[in-house]
């Protein structure tokens, strides 16, 4: 095509996670998928300076067709900011990742005490549960609701019936997954909610209860101030 165009990002979802905490000896891959016309070139900076092969033992790989930088067997000296600079004659764009190389003993995910907290709201109200997770290794986080089937909370095997409400996926950021929003609450939403965090060492989970109260009468609704639930 003759349509000249400055560089642009083609897959911002793959770039959302800026902070990468990676265990020592693991492989790190940073991606900056881009487009433009003419096709842009890509170069990498470490802490704002040109990143050269001799800057690290074993060097690194650049896969131009995948717009990626790959470092194998990372060590503490690899910590820092890595910036991809994508440019053509019509412009330049850049994106920075921060790499932290974790040396301490990896442990089960730690969930902040008291979270998620029990909550109550009226029918039609909104509620949110918050879960704060600390993990050396990248955790996978899920929000789970304990549900009933045929009036029972447990199956014939004695295990509880569960429904995964939300799980970290390709398009979900760490911050988004830490909060579970429930809008326009109904009585069916009442019950036990569990935040589960797992990594390669193990799984940890905390639970909280949602209590749903009947909505007040219409007269109260009209006269009540917006913060009458507090």
């Amino acid at each position: 095509s003759n349509n000249k165009r400055a560089p642009y990002w083609t897959n911002t979802e793959k770039m959302e996670k800026r902070l990468h905490a990676v265990p020592a000896a693991n492989t790190v891959k940073f991606r900056c998928p881009a487009g433009g016309n003419p096709m842009p070139t890509m170069r990498w900076l470490k802490n704002g300076k040109e990143f050269k092969q001799e800057h690290r033992i074993g060097g690194y790989k650049v896969r131009n067709q995948h717009w990626s930088l790959i470092m194998e067997s990372v060590v503490p000296s690899d910590k820092g900011n890595y910036t991809c600079v994508v440019e053509n004659e019509y412009g330049s764009i850049n994106h920075t990742y921060h790499l932290d190389v974790v040396e301490r003993s990896p442990h089960r995910p730690i969930l902040q005490a008291g979270l998620p907290a029990n909550a109550s709201t009226v029918v039609g109200g909104d509620v949110e549960f918050v879960c704060k997770v600390y993990s050396d290794a990248q955790p996978h986080i899920q929000w789970i609701k304990h549900v009933e089937k045929n009036g029972s909370k447990y199956g014939p095997d004695g295990l509880p019936y569960l429904k995964v409400l939300k799980a970290a996926g390709v398009n979900t950021t760490d911050k988004e997954i830490e909060v579970l929003y429930i809008r326009n609450v109904t009585f069916e939403d009442a019950g036990e909610y569990t935040c589960l965090a797992g990594n390669s060492i193990g799984i940890s989970f905390h639970s909280a209860w949602l209590t749903v109260l009947p909505a007040p009468g219409r007269e109260k609704e009209i006269t009540a101030s917006p913060d009458y639930l507090e």
Epitope: V22, P23, A25, N26, S105, P106, H107, R108, I110, L111, Q112, A113, A137, Q138, H140, Q142, I144, L159, P160, L162, V164, T194, L196, G198, N199, S200, I201, G202, I203, S204, F205, H206
Partner: antibody, heavy 124, light 112 residues
């Protein structure tokens, strides 16, 4: 039936390499972290390495760091341990062990299923 | 690294009598989720270890109720309430809270 079956053990000279494999069946392999644990003849158990369910995180015991590499192929339900620069003290039975899964569990979250083990002898 | 210290190294108990194995960790295994991540295994000659007890005191499926686990934070106990002939084995404790995962040195249980 949930099963882990190790293979690839044998006798090897110090400094040489060996690759162990573990074939998993009876469960969703791609949803579980996996470990290697070893046991020297007449001795206790020693944890060797772990790999996350998707292969993105790996951890090693200090005694094997830089020499052993754990990997997995979820399309083939296979766990591997590449052992380089082998030493006499690496002589042991190597067990493949299922680790934590990705979801909610009412039982133990891993270290419940062990393979039968494969013997590695490092001797000159 | 967390050090797991088991005692005694070996134990001879009469059939039908109680066997008690101790395990001490160099730091607390009580996690923020309220669970204590100590596991107990039984290993017979020529076999892989078998899980008996997980998370301090939970019996794994199929494990006879004569096996029980107890303790708190750093001090743990595996008890066989009435020793049977098939219980002759080596028993290991393990911490499952952080890597490197570590095991006790083992306790060999025999019949007196």
């Amino acid at each position: 039936e949930v099963q882990l079956l190790e293979s690839g053990g044998g006798v090897v000279q110090p400094g040489r390499s060996l690759r162990l494999s573990c074939a998993a069946s009876g469960f969703t392999f791609s949803s579980y972290a996996m470990h290697w644990v070893r046991q020297a003849p007449g001795k206790g158990l020693e944890w060797v390495a772990v790999i996350s369910y998707d292969g993105s995180n790996k951890y090693y015991a200090d005694s094997v760091k830089g020499r052993f590499t754990i990997s997995r192929d979820n399309s083939k339900n296979t766990l591997s341990l590449q052992m380089n620069s082998l030493r006499v003290e690496d002589t042991a039975i190597y067990y493949c062990v299922r680790g934590a899964g990705r979801g909610y569990t009412y039982g133990p979250d891993g270290f419940d299923i062990w393979g039968q083990g494969t013997m590695v002898t490092v001797s000159s | 690294d967390i050090v797991m210290t088991q005692s005694p190294d070996s134990l001879a108990v009469s059939l039908g009598e109680r066997a008690t194995i101790s395990c001490t960790s160099s730091r607390s295994l009580l996690h923020s989720d309220g669970k204590t991540y100590v596991y107990w295994y039984q290993q017979k000659p020529g076999q892989p270890p078998k899980l008996l007890i997980y998370e301090l005191s939970n019996r794994f499926s199929g494990v006879p109720d004569r096996f029980s686990g107890s303790g708190s934070r750093t001090d743990f106990t595996l008890t066989i309430s009435s020793l049977q002939a098939e219980d002759v084995a080596v028993y290991y404790c393990m911490q499952y809270i952080e890597a490197p995962l570590t095991f006790g040195g083992g306790t060999k249980v025999e019949i007196k």
